[in-house]
């Protein structure tokens, strides 16, 4: 059975992660982890007066 | 085809330890997370943990309820994951399902039934 | 825990008919990075493992059929059949894959007049 991409990259999109889309990738442990369970902090509110850096990265279909 | 095929179950006393396994078909063994779940007679589903894939190094996570005495492995040389049962309780008495974890449980075994009694 | 609530337990409805069932959660399953909610349903028929049907609260699994929908945010989901056949005798299972543990519901048994 064939695997299907595990990510969907946009132009300026963050590299895939090896997350099954189940799970997120914490940056700030270098592992898949449950999306509530990052320990990584949380992006920035939109609106903020700079871009809100890529913390977790969660793989789409 | 996808195919998930647990076996291993059976009668066993309490104090005593029950290793089960899940044989697998039609995917690549190493790309997936696989996870075990049970189900007491008559009751709902309880998650008890999962093994990762080869990219994040086969790492475990584990329901507290049973972590300490289930442990969760793989044989990808054979194509099987298994899981090792000790110090079994009574309340332990459950058909067990191995599956495969993608998007969620995405597919399931038919389930393996294990009795603890003495 | 996150602790799942199905309701109701149990109902009977007629072929034909739609079903609405419901799950809540105690903490929210949004992910608000990705705006998805963690939580996926499941069909267990009498005698058979479970299968699942929805993932990320709304997605429909490849194979089921549409006349299965679910439904929800944050903390409130639900799984609707808009017409009941008879194969849909079984229980229905609600789980978040949001946090570990993984909690599953109790289970809604849907029965056929």
């Known amino acids: 059975m064939r695997r299907g991409p595990r990510s969907l990259r946009g132009r300026d999109a963050p590299a895939p992660t090896p997350c099954v889309p189940a799970e997120c990738f914490d940056l700030l442990v270098r592992h898949c982890v449950a999306c509530g369970a990052l320990r990584t902090p949380r992006p920035k509110p939109a609106g903020a007066s700079s871009p809100a850096p890529r913390t977790a990265l969660q793989p789409q279909e | 085809e996808v195919k998930l095929v647990e076996s291993g179950g059976g009668l066993v006393q309490p104090g005593g330890s029950l290793r089960l396994s899940c044989a697998i078909s039609?995917?690549?063994?190493?790309?997936?997370?696989m996870s075990w779940v049970r189900q007491p007679p008559g009751k709902a589903l309880e998650w008890l943990g999962f093994?990762?894939?080869?990219?994040?190094?086969?790492?475990?996570e584990y329901n507290p309820s049973v972590k300490g005495r289930f442990t969760i492995s793989r044989d990808n040389s054979q194509s099987i994951f298994y899981l090792q049962m000790n110090t079994l309780r009574a309340e332990d008495s459950a058909t067990y399902y191995c599956a495969q974890v993608r998007r969620a449980l995405d597919y399931w075994g038919q389930g393996t039934t294990v009795t603890v009694s003495a | 825990d996150i602790v799942m609530s199905q309701s109701p337990s149990s109902l009977a409805v007629s072929v034909g008919e739609k079903v609405t069932m419901s799950c809540k959660s105690s903490?929210?399953?949004?992910?608000?990075?990705?705006?998805?909610?963690?939580l996926a349903w499941y069909q267990q028929k009498p005698g058979q493992s479970p299968k699942l049907l929805i993932y990320w609260a709304s997605t429909r699994e490849s194979g089921v059929p549409d006349r299965f929908t679910g439904s929800g945010s944050g903390t409130d989901f639900t799984l609707t059949i808009s017409s009941v056949k008879a194969e849909d005798l079984a229980v229905y299972y609600c789980?978040?894959?949001?946090?570990?543990?993984?909690?599953f519901g109790g289970g809604t048994k849907l029965e056929i007049k």
């Open positions: 903490q929210s399953l949004l992910y608000s990075s990705n705006q998805n909610n963690y």
């Open positions: 789980q978040q894959y949001y946090t570990y543990p993984y909690t």
């Open positions: 039609g995917f690549t063994v190493t790309a997936y997370y």
């Open positions: 093994i990762r894939d080869k990219a994040n190094g086969y790492t475990t």
